[in-house]
């Protein structure tokens, strides 16, 4: 059976990213076209054929290139991905005998968490704040020496596509916490990172 094999990719913001399509069980295509899927109709990005070589549409001139030149295996590379590049891309193999055969590969852009952890004493209580900003939205947990400590969490979405999750640990008897370690755990894309803070009495 003639088919196109693709793989979705997740890459970090402002780094290169590549999407690959492989035409299986068919002869070389006559032409390969890459399109970005859009709400109304797909947008042509780049084509490759024997006669014409690589033809990049003006909107993508300095953004992408075909880095695997083939009529059975084709790879496009984004030099420096932005949030606008997130989405799904179609590769169309125009073949002799089978017509147009397409595959879809999706690109997800992530931003590594930026974490801040600090504390503040007031007269009768201690607030420890852990804030993590990432894409997709991170999750924040606490690891404290004893149970029963309340926390509140606020989530804020930013125009740049990242999300900040801020969790505040409210400790009512701050004296008991002095010298002890509090751990803020940030979960992002399946990875948990610990951020440790030892409370010292100012």
């Amino acid at each position: 059976q003639v088919q196109v094999v693709t793989q979705d990719e997740r890459e970090q913001l402002y780094t290169p990213a590549s999407l690959k399509c492989s035409l299986q069980n068919a002869q070389e295509a006559l032409i390969v076209t890459w399109q970005k899927k859009k709400a109304v109709s797909p947008e042509n990005m780049v084509t490759f054929s024997e006669n014409h070589g690589v033809v990049i549409q003006p909107a993508y001139k300095d953004k992408i290139n075909i880095t695997q030149l083939g009529l059975q295996n084709s790879t496009i590379t984004f030099w420096n991905i932005t949030l606008e590049d997130e989405g799904c891309y179609m590769c169309l193999f125009n073949t002799f005998g089978f017509g147009k055969i397409s595959g879809t590969a999706c690109l997800t852009v992530y931003v590594q968490p930026i974490v801040s952890l600090h504390y503040k004493f007031s007269e009768d209580h201690l607030n420890i704040t852990c804030s993590a900003t990432a894409r997709p939205a991170p999750m924040v947990f606490w690891k404290v020496p004893r149970s029963g400590i309340e926390n509140s969490t606020v989530t804020l979405s930013h125009p740049n596509g990242t999300t900040s999750v801020t969790s505040i640990l409210h400790i009512k008897d701050p004296k008991n916490q002095v010298g002890k370690e509090v751990i803020c755990q940030v979960l992002h894309l399946g990875t948990v990172t610990d951020f440790k803070q030892t409370v010292n009495k100012g």
Partner: antibody
Framework: EVKLVESGGGLVKPGGSLKLSCAAS????????MSWVRQTPEKRLEWVAS???????YYLDSVKGRFTISRDIARNILYLQMSSLRSEDTAMYYC?????????????WGQGTTLTVSS | DIVLTQSPASLAVSLGQRATISCRAS??????????MHWYQQKPGQPPKLLIY???NLESGIPARFSGSGSRTDFTLTINPVEADDVATYYC?????????FGGGTKLEIK
Amino acid sequence: EVKLVESGGGLVKPGGSLKLSCAASGFTFSGFAMSWVRQTPEKRLEWVASISSGGTTYYLDSVKGRFTISRDIARNILYLQMSSLRSEDTAMYYCARGNYYSGTSYDYWGQGTTLTVSS
Amino acid sequence: DIVLTQSPASLAVSLGQRATISCRASESVDSYGNSFMHWYQQKPGQPPKLLIYRASNLESGIPARFSGSGSRTDFTLTINPVEADDVATYYCQQSNEDPRTFGGGTKLEIK
């Protein structure tokens, strides 16, 4: 530095055979389309045959069935096997690299090797 | 086959002046918003050398005195100003359709 060096030309009788070679260096040979282009004694340039990066071959109608283009990727050599040669095949034969990023124009050429078909 | 007709067959230009060479295709060589017409320079005893690709793109290392323009069927190579080193034969070539074809050449001389 990209270098293409042709060899194998010579004087052949009509109906005879000859094999041209082109040794390539300075680039990833398998990643480019390679072609043979000839120049007649009247200085007209004529594309003869090409082999794509994927190995697909293309020929000028007048040489189809008589000429075979091939390559040895391990040794970076392009070949043109010519048989049933005719007087009109007399020309300087150039090996040229087709660049996929510049509309498959020929961005590098060898110095050429001469084929003379005469009785 | 696409026939490329170059004119003039030869021209003589004074040093420092402009040289204009025309190439007319028997049918359009445009696809995907690009013109698949290329220009080469050939000096005696040497192979052709790529000057301009896809109608107007200057090949790396070629002086900016050389420029290309045109679309569909009508293309022009301009050399301005002409230098003594530019004495050569110039060829246009299309890669829009197989077989790839070349023009008959234009011989440039210094007046």
